[in-house]
């Protein structure tokens, strides 16, 4: 058993039929010594008396809010949550496996630049009685500070018969050095509580591996005289790290016909312009990637040819 927060305890249980469970001793937070009784949740059934209560925790029915009373007055509450371990593996019932980039990916994170700011998100089908708490650091043995905000519901989607809820959190490394070579990874830890079930999820990454630039901005076409060619120009996204001479991007320019089956013409360039042939009803799209490190491509920025 360990304390998650003040008065909230997590009981770690091996989850199998007829498991012995864990013995837990609760102490009433009061200077009183006599006449103390204990109840669980909304029940008025007295579980025991005295300043301490000893219970055997085996199942969810044994978890919950234990309250000590004296003479009809509530003295204090303690909450017991369960963390299940089945066949040596901690349960992952609360979050959905996103399966990208690999199986057992529950947390996904992205950064728009090298400033030390990043966003993580996760999915669940649970809509109520759900709480998340996020902590982060760089390194684990001698951790350096990373500050995360509150996790918030960022999207709701319908997937077949189920609703899926996306939560996200923004974090910022306290003393980020954008130009430095990373040697220790960022660690992100998410505590999830659903009703009386506790689970924790972790992710470890280097900022350089989760970089995904915003799409190029100000995408414009300039027809070339007496030609089917156009000059496409764009700019670095505002959110990209500066100076651009050091934090450089490379770009992919694509000409795509109206039909998805039509052949795509692609040009790769380090410049912020390119000359392409603009076919009727086609569109021109540009995306960006870190020039010196193969992290994710940005989403496409697009304009119609006409």
């Amino acid at each position: 058993i360990w304390e998650l927060k003040k008065d909230v305890y997590v009981v770690e249980l091996d989850w199998y039929p007829d498991a012995p469970g864990e013995m837990v001793v609760l102490t009433c937070d009061t200077p009183e010594e006599d006449g103390i009784t204990w109840t669980l949740d909304q029940s008025s059934e007295v579980l025991g008396s005295g300043k301490t209560l000893t219970i055997q925790v085996k199942e969810f029915g044994d978890a919950g809010q234990y309250t000590c009373h004296k003479g009809g007055e509530v003295l204090s509450h303690s909450l017991l949550l369960l963390h299940k371990k089945e066949d040596g593996i901690w349960s992952t019932d609360i979050l959905k496996d996103q399966k990208e980039p690999k199986n057992k990916t529950f947390l996904r994170c992205e950064a728009k630049n090298y400033s030390g700011r990043f966003t993580c998100w996760w999915l669940t089908t649970i809509s109520t009685d759900l709480t998340f708490s996020v902590k982060s650091s760089r390194g684990s043995s001698d951790p350096q500070g990373v500050t995360c905000g509150a996790a918030t519901l960022s999207a709701e989607r319908v997937r077949g018969d189920n609703k899926e809820y996306e939560y996200s959190v923004e974090c910022q490394e306290d003393s980020a050095c954008p130009a430095a070579e990373e040697s220790l990874p960022i660690e992100v830890m998410v505590d999830a509580v659903h009703k009386l079930k506790y689970e924790n999820y972790t992710s470890s990454f280097f900022i350089r591996d989760i970089i995904k630039p915003d799409p190029p901005k100000n995408l414009q076409l300039k027809p070339l005289k007496n030609s089917r060619q156009v000059e496409v120009s764009w700019e670095y996204p505002d959110t990209w790290s500066t100076p651009h001479s050091y934090f450089s991007l490379t770009f992919c320019v694509q000409v795509q016909g109206k039909s998805k089956r039509e052949k795509k013409d692609r040009v790769f360039t380090d410049k912020t312009s390119a000359t392409v042939i603009c076919r009727k009803n086609a569109s021109i799209s540009v995306r960006a990637q870190d020039r010196y490190y193969s992290s994710s491509w940005s989403e496409w920025a697009s304009v119609p040819c006409s």
Partner: nanobody, 123 residues
């Protein structure tokens, strides 16, 4: 610097309703349990209601159970107390408090306090 600012107090007739709010700043709101206490003239400060940092986890004093509802909006860093079927004995200064304990009914369980908002119930 942590600040808790209550608002919404005022004069209300017996049987009426009122909602008081408490806006928090300078703390990671979602990590804190929030509570309302009240103090009537010449009386001790007493616990009214608490909402833990855990979703949907609340506690109420017997005197307000069924009439008052505490709720919180983590996105707005705000906790609310909806007071219905008000009685003259509910007249008091209402104080908002924030603490890291799960659900405490004692003032020592809360590290931060607001300045209070006065609710007066006339008969």
């Amino acid at each position: 610097e942590v600040q808790l600012v209550e608002s919404g107090g005022g004069l209300v007739q017996a049987g009426g309703s009122r909602r008081v709010s408490c806006a928090a700043s300078g703390l990671t709101f979602s990590d804190y349990s929030m509570a309302w206490f009240r103090q009537a003239p010449g009386k001790e400060r007493e616990f009214v209601a608490a909402h833990a940092w855990l979703a949907s986890t609340t506690d109420y004093a017997d005197s307000v159970k069924g009439r008052f509802t505490i709720s919180r909006d983590n996105a707005k860093n705000t906790v609310y107390l909806q007071m219905n079927s008000l009685k003259p004995e509910d007249t008091a200064a209402y104080y908002c408090a924030a603490g890291q304990r799960y659900l405490s009914r004692v003032s020592q369980g809360y590290e931060y306090w607001g300045q209070g908002t006065q609710v007066t119930v006339s008969s």
